[in-house]
Interface confidence: low
């Protein structure tokens, strides 16, 4: 599923991401835009053999199990395929664990490079939330 900007903002708010660990909703929508272009089915292979999955590009080395990544920790205790669902519950729940891990949203390279320090509220402007 490819979400619309406001559609995703509403879904993320419903799942409790607004101001989760101090990160406003705009941060999460911005991260999803530059990680996956709002596509729940996005996958990208990394040079270390791991793969990033879903709308927030969650990594199989640490967070989910795809049966293909040597040394996977599966800290979210989920199959990576769950992160590709049009229902973003699994991605959100895992993202909450990631953002609580110490580095906050710096764990997402795209957020660090494209969203951090920018007017992230622009990503939810005009949305009925």
């Amino acid at each position: 599923k490819v979400f619309g900007r406001c559609e995703l903002a509403a879904a993320m708010k419903r799942h409790g991401l607004d101001n989760y660990r101090g990160y406003s909703l705009g941060n999460w929508v911005c991260a999803a835009k530059f990680e996956s272009n709002f596509n729940t089915q996005a996958t990208n292979r990394n040079t270390d053999g791991s793969t990033d999955y879903g709308i927030l590009q969650i990594n199989s080395r640490w967070w989910c199990n795809d049966g293909r990544t040597p040394g996977s920790r599966n800290l979210c205790n989920i199959p990576c395929s769950a992160l590709l669902s049009s229902d973003i519950t699994a991605s959100v729940n895992c993202a909450k664990k990631i953002v609580s891990d110490g580095n906050g949203m710096n764990a997402w390279v795209a957020w660090r490079n494209r969203c951090k320090g920018t007017d992230v509220q622009a990503w939810i402007r005009g949305c009925r939330l």
């Epitope: 089915q41 053999g49 049966g67 293909r68």
Partner: antibody, heavy 115, light 107 residues
């Protein structure tokens, strides 16, 4: 139960192209990788590459880049592999398999003869 | 690419014998090694995943061991239905690679 059903045997002329299909049933097609494997007598098994049907993401063995092209139709739960510019070296049995690192579920194989 | 070398190429045994098939990797692949059996005109069948985990429905006489670069598939008291080709496969890195196979035949 999980099943992968491949298309039937093909006899093709050198230089032609062929498209092999692999229809998946019994599981969520979009969220598992489909792998393609080549087997020639005396050459063992060779991994050609893989596709994740839901996203269209593909990864190819360098050896088969330009030779194989993967696609998938999620409406029919079918993965396809097209082989182009066929030569006698492409004569083989081609398998699809569901990818989990290891391959528990396999298609029955499609025999391609280039002659 | 990781190269997998299987030995011996052919193993001639009598039913009831116990045998060991070897698979050696060109570099360490941890435990990311899987074993398949293939009969003529059939698709490969997964016997063992991740070096030593037996698949459901596979007879207990099949077992796997090893780590790093050296791996072994053992068959305790071979039965006639066990004859065929055996392949190892690594999933430690891309491209996935298979060994050249060991043919288990009746003496």
């Amino acid at each position: 139960q999980v099943q992968l059903q491949e298309s039937g045997a093909e006899v093709m002329k050198p230089g032609a192209s062929v498209k092999i299909s692999c229809k998946a049933t019994g599981y969520t097609f979009t969220t598992y990788w489909i792998e393609w494997v080549k087997q020639r007598p005396g050459h063992g098994l060779e991994w050609i590459g893989e596709i994740l049907p839901g996203s269209g993401s593909t990864y190819y063995n360098e050896k088969f880049k330009g030779k194989a092209t993967f696609t998938a139709d999620t409406s029919s739960n079918t993965a396809y592999m097209q082989l182009s510019s066929l030569t006698s070296e492409d004569s083989a049995v081609y398998y699809c398999a569901r990818g989990d690192g290891h391959y528990y579920y396999w298609g029955q194989g499609t025999t391609l003869t280039v002659s | 690419d990781i190269e997998l070398t299987q030995s011996p190429a052919t193993l001639s045994v009598t039913p009831g014998d116990s045998v060991s098939l070897s698979c050696r990797a060109s570099q360490s692949i941890s435990n990311n090694l899987h074993w398949y059996q293939q009969k003529p005109h059939e698709s490969p069948r997964l016997l063992i995943k991740y070096t030593s985990q037996s698949m459901s429905g596979i007879p207990s006489r099949f077992s796997g061991s090893g780590s790093g670069t050296d791996f072994t598939l053992s068959i305790n008291s071979v039965e006639t239905e066990d004859f065929g080709m055996y392949f190892c496969q690594q999933s430690n890195s891309w491209p996935r690679t298979f060994g050249g196979g060991t043919k288990l035949e009746i003496k």
